[in-house]
Each structure stands twice: as C-alpha cells, then as structure tokens.
Interface confidence: medium
C-alpha cells in the first residue's frame, strides 16, 4: 500500500519516541565514529522534517524515500572524509547504490574505546539529570559498537535499561540492585547482537532462500501444530522483517515486526498454545517474548515421513512441480517431529534429501534410487551427537575456564594466522557452550549447542572477513552456511604454519594485572596461551599445562608481594627463561 510520504507514514505508525530512537540507531550503525552530539542533531533535524510531512504529505521532499532522506542527511556530516576515508565516496552515488555502499562500510570491529562503567552514583546522577539524553546515549553506544543489532530489540533493551535505573537509583543499596541488572543486560545484549549478526550474514552472504530454510526449520520446531501454509506465511513475513533490519531499513523493520506480532497473537489458535502469556504483554515485550517462546508440544500420532517422501510414487512428480515448496514441506515435516535436532542438522538433512532427489529423479528407476535416502541421514545425526557428548564430558571434567583453554589451543593450532584477540574472544565464547548447554537433558543439548556454535563461528567469520589471513577460515566460512561447524571441527593442525618469532615483550607482565577483574585476568592468561601456541604449535597439552600453571603461580606470587613491580620484572624473566626451556624455544 503506497503512501504519499513514507517518512510521515512511519512517523505516524511508530510514534515520535520510537521514530527518534530508531533513526538514532540507524545513523549510529552507519556512522560509527561520529560524536553523540552530532547524531542527536541529525536525528532532531530528521524528526522536525518528518513532522512537517505529517502535517502536509505533499510538502517539499516528503515524497522522497527514506534511504534518500537519511542518506542525504548523513552526507551533510562535515568530517566524513577525514573520519571515514573512502566511505565518503558513497555520497557521490545515487540510491540504491549509496545505501548499499554505506552497508558495505559497516564495521563489525570498530576502533572504539571499551565502554567503562562509571560509579553507580555517577550513573544515577546522570540518569536523574537528563533521563532522555542518558537513554539516547545508551542506544548510541550499543548501536555504533554493534552495527547489525536488531533495532526493535534494542528498543526493548533500552526499556529494560531505563527500568533498572528507575528502580535501583531509589534503592538503599544502589550498586547491589543495579550492577547485576546491568551485567545481565550486557550479556544478553552481546548474545542478541551475535544471533542477529548470523541472520544478517545468512541473508547477505547466502541469500533469502538460505534464511527462509533456516526459518522454516526453526518455526516448525517451535510451532509443530501449525499448518505448513501457516508456517510459510510466518516465514515470509519474518524474512521481510530481517531483510529490512539487515539492510538498514529500521523504521520499516520495526513497523513490520509489530504487524507480525499482532498477526501471530490474533491467530495464536492456529499457531501455538504457548503464546498466550506473550500476547498479553506490551508491544516490545510481546515481540521479544514471541521470539523466545518455548516449543509447543508435538501433535500426537504424526504419521511416518517415509509415506510421503520416500514410499509415494509421486515423490519425483511433486518435487518437479514445485521444488522449493516440496522441500519446504519436507523440512517442515522433519523439523516439527525433531525439536531434539539443531536447525543446522535439519538443514543438512534437507540438503541431502534434495541432492538425492536431483540425482534419482533423473535415474532409470527413481524409486529404487531414493528408497534408502533416510539411511544417509544416520551418520549426519550421529556426528553432532557424538561431538556434543565428548565435549560435554570434557567440560564437566575441566570446568569452564580450562575448557576454554582447551578450545583456545585446539583452534589456535587449526588457524594460527588469526589474530590473538579474535582467537581469544571466539574460543572463550565457544567454551561458554558448556555451561549454556551441557546442563540440558539429551533432547535439548543438540539444538542448544550446535545452533549456539553457529552463532559463535559466525563471529569468527565476520571478524576474519574484515582482514582475511587464513584460506582455511575463508573456506569454512564461505562454502556452506550449515556446514561451517563440521568444517571447523574437521580441521587438523595447520602444518603449513611457520611458527611466530619469540618475543619476550609478549610475555612481560606488570602489577596492573593484580587490579583486574577475574574475567580480565583470565583474558590476559588466555592471550599468553594463544601466543605460546603460535610460537610452539607442536607443544603438547602437558607442556602447555606446565607453563600455564607456572604462569598462574607467578601472577599469584607477585600480586601478594610488597614490591609487585619488581617481582613482576625479576620473576617474569625467570618465567620466560623456564618456559623457553620447557617448550624448547
């Protein structure tokens, strides 16, 4: 339904508060280095312009597309060339090329200072002094660091952020009330950002068909009582929402997400019995709740899949007439019966089925050819099951920190060319799969673990894409979205790697390590571990363990010393010498 003025349409649909917040997110995700004040100024100008269009949709420029309006506004930034370099060339292009150009310059790892949390009293004072600016600053800081953050979901986080300050700044013990809430928001926010980044990578690198297949599988698991046509409807609408958000069309995305939540709640009887509570909540909470809702119970007495997809004489006919619909039905039927499988496993099974039909439907006796297709699924199912079993046993044996270290060593040996900070970040996140998923019963372990690993490995892929250094990473990241994890799992030690030159400076530590949080101290030690492996890729587990134990003892000893700095200098030299001897460096 065409509107005379798109900007007026979205302003009226979303309301001024959400409109301003979403425009701020959009601008901060595009121009990640711009100061907060500059973005606020641009947002206010756009908002005032939108209001004139609401008053008169025929007013000058009101008929322009949102990309044109927003792009024109971004291109007024005076320091564009100095701050962003070649990104300024985007402004010489016309829409839609200009927006595509801005999208290509989004930086997953912007060179921005780490967000340091001020004292609670300082934060509460800032919150009370100017609540609106305080919350805008939150949106800005998150959006510029996470340029693909799901914008309507960021509004939900901001609402929770505001609620935390409203409650806790009045509490007797402000810190005890506020800090755990902020920690929870930070951790959930990082997870939400990474999950959305995978959705955008799926759409942008592998296309709409890949995203739709993922969505069919996931929604069929979640809504197993819904008809195939209903699932297809939801998939179509969900794909539109995520395509818009990943493409920077945040106003349309938020608007369409609200429409989708409304549709789901109006039709919950034909979708899922688990939606009732979600649908009673306000809009932002409702959308979030629907996205996280538990799987509905599977319908009783579902017939065997073999009848329609293997035994039927019409398999090749049905496939030939509408390949994607038939494969969609197969994926739907398989997924609704298997909430215990990961989405990526279900997609591998569907791909195997498709490949078999492509081959067999051209054969002399198609039925004979595809009759055993389900037997081909067995090894595909067993591979992740076995991997998860082994790694959960290892996690239970080692605990999270040491499990992360085992993965650090494993992945550094596989892809030693990758930067140390990336290896540390990715391996730490891979290691979190243990505490996140191993506690679950068997039936929930695989969807938890393998789909989480897909999200983490995508982080590796997007960070590596910025500065590619390893052909092996590029290969695993680009060949197949659903086979990324098996591809990385199958990598052995990189025999072509030339060990890094030993640099004593890398292993020189100072007294400041003693004041770090436990997490930061772990990261320092894990950074050293990665560097050790890069110097000595053939080092055994035992050798590495010995050196790391010595290192931990050294840090503990010097942090207890009266003259910490002297201890670190003197004992550090001894540790480096001992480590070199132990590893034969």
């Amino acid at each position: 339904d065409a509107h005379k003025s798109e900007v007026a349409h979205r302003f009226k649909d979303l309301g001024e508060e959400n409109f301003k917040a979403l425009v701020l997110i959009a601008f901060a995700q595009y121009l990640q280095q711009c100061p907060f004040e500059d973005h606020v100024k641009l947002v206010n100008e756009v908002t005032e312009f939108a209001k004139t269009c609401v008053a008169d949709e025929s007013a000058e420029n009101c008929d322009k597309s949102l990309h044109t309006l927003f792009g024109d506004k971004l291109c007024t930034v005076a320091t564009l060339r100095e701050t962003y370099g070649e990104m300024a060339d985007c402004c010489a292009k016309q829409e839609p090329e200009r927006n595509e150009c801005f999208l290509q310059h989004k930086d997953d790892n912007p060179n921005l200072p780490r967000l340091v949390r001020p004292e609670v009293d300082v934060m509460c004072t800032a919150f009370h002094d100017n609540e609106e600016t305080f919350l805008k600053k939150y949106l800005y800081e998150i959006a510029r660091r996470h340029p693909y953050f799901y914008a309507p979901e960021l509004l939900f986080f901001a609402k929770r952020y505001k609620a935390a300050f409203t409650e806790c700044c009045q509490a007797a013990d402000k810190a005890a009330c506020l800090l755990p809430k902020l920690d929870e928001l930070r951790d959930e926010g990082k997870a939400s950002s990474a999950k959305q980044r995978l959705k955008c990578a799926s759409l942008q690198k592998f296309g709409e068909r890949a995203f739709k297949a993922w969505a069919v599988a996931r929604l069929s698991q979640r809504f197993p009582k819904a008809e195939f046509a209903e699932v297809s409807k939801l998939v179509t609408d969900l794909t539109k929402v995520h395509t818009e958000c990943c493409h920077g069309d945040l106003l349309e995305c938020a608007d369409d997400r609200a429409d989708l939540a409304k549709y789901i709640c109006e039709n919950q009887d034909s979708i899922s019995s688990k939606l009732k509570e979600c649908c009673e909540k306000p809009l932002l909470e409702k959308s979030h709740c629907i996205a996280e809702v538990e799987n509905d119970e599977m319908p009783a007495d579902l017939p065997s899949l073999a009848a329609d997809f293997v035994e039927s004489k019409d398999v090749c006919k049905n496939y030939a007439e509408a390949k994607d619909v038939f494969l969609g039905m197969f994926l739907y039927e398989y997924a609704r019966r298997h909430p215990d499988y990961s989405v990526v496993l279900l997609l591998r099974l569907a791909k195997t089925y498709e490949t078999t039909l492509e081959k067999c439907c051209a054969a002399a006796d198609p039925h004979e050819c595809y009759a055993k297709v389900f037997d081909e699924f067995k090894p595909l199912v067993e591979e992740p099951q076995n991997l998860i079993k082994q790694n959960c046993e290892l996690f239970e044996q080692l605990g999270e920190y040491k499990f992360q270290n085992a993965l650090l060593v494993r992945y550094t040996k596989k892809v030693p060319q990758v930067s140390t900070p990336t290896l540390v970040e990715v391996s730490r996140n891979l290691g979190k799969v243990g505490s996140k998923c191993c506690k679950h019963p068997e039936a929930k372990r695989m969807p938890c673990a393998e789909d989480y690993l897909s999200v983490v490995l995508n982080q590796l892929c997007v960070l590596h894409e910025k500065t590619p250094v390893s052909d092996r990473v590029t290969k695993c990241c680009t060949e197949s979205l659903v086979n990324r994890r098996p591809c990385f799992s199958a990598l052995e030690v990189d025999e072509t790697y030339v060990p890094k030159e030993f640099n004593a400076e890398t292993f020189t530590f100072h007294a400041d390590i003693c004041t770090l949080s436990e997490k930061e101290r772990q990261i320092k030690k894990q950074t050293a571990l990665v560097e050790l492996v890069k110097h000595k890729p053939k080092a055994t587990k035992e050798q590495l363990k010995a050196v790391m134990d010595d290192f931990a003892a050294f840090v503990e000893k010097c942090c207890k010393a009266d003259d910490k700095e002297t201890c670190f200098a003197e004992e550090g030299k001894k540790l480096v010498a001992a480590s070199q001897a132990a590893l034969g460096l």
Partner: nanobody, 119 residues
Framework: EVQLLESGGGVVQPGGSLRLSCAAS????????MLWVRQAPGKGLEWVSV????????YYADSVKGRFTISRDNSKNTLYLQMNSLRAEDTAVYYC????????????WGQGTLVTVKS
C-alpha cells in the same frame, strides 16, 4: 457440509485469458489456506498455486509462474485464479481445494471446471 464450487472455465485461444472463481461454504474460509490443482486429459494431478488465509504469501508451480495469479476475497468466501498468456498445455480440469493441513493430501475438493486452450 463443506462445498467448493468452481466456475469460469471455457474455451480460449493460445495467449488468451480466463478468470476462474471458487465459491466456498461449510467451513471457516478466512482461516483456511486454499489452492488450485489441475488434471490434464490422461494425466495425474498437478498443483498450480497456493494462497495463505491472509492473502500472502502465494506460491506457484514453475510451469505457471508469471502467467497465473491467485487471489481471494475473504468477505465473499471466494478464491480466484487469473490465467493470462494461456498455452495449449494449460488445458485441464481445474479444481479448487482446501490446502492440506500438513501432508501431501488435500482435505476437500470441488467438482472442477474445464479449461480448453486451442486455436
């Protein structure tokens, strides 16, 4: 009792157009996905197009994509199929049906309307 009544078939020249209608009763039409299927003389059933209860999304068999358009009017409990650029191979009896709840089986059928494309 579920009833589906197709109409609009006839004889048309290649390149011509026809609009089929299907009047539905006896079930809640606006919560049911619907489809058109066809059966050419001496051939098996071939599905043509599916439409969701809300009107989107729609799906088409590769053989009719770009030429046929499925639509519905929930207020009139009616399903439509606009057929343009008709070809000889489109000659068939066209049936409207209630979309299968999950498996490749169709719940309810009409009696069909014959479309003949010949010069």
């Amino acid at each position: 009792e579920v009833q589906l009544l197709e109409s609009g078939g006839g004889v048309v020249q290649p390149g011509g157009s026809l609009r089929l209608s299907c009047a539905a009763s006896g079930f809640t039409f606006d919560t049911s996905s619907m489809l058109w299927v066809r059966q050419a003389p001496g051939k098996g059933l071939e599905w043509v197009s599916v439409i969701h209860q809300s009107g989107t999304p729609t799906y088409y068999a590769d053989s009719v994509k770009g030429r046929f358009t499925i639509s519905r009017d929930n207020s009139k409990n009616t399903l439509y199929l606009q057929m343009n650029s008709l070809r000889a191979e489109d000659t068939a009896v066209y049936y409207c049906a209630k979309f299968p709840s999950s498996r490749m089986k169709f719940d309810y059928w009409g009696q069909g309307t014959l479309v003949t494309v010949k010069s």
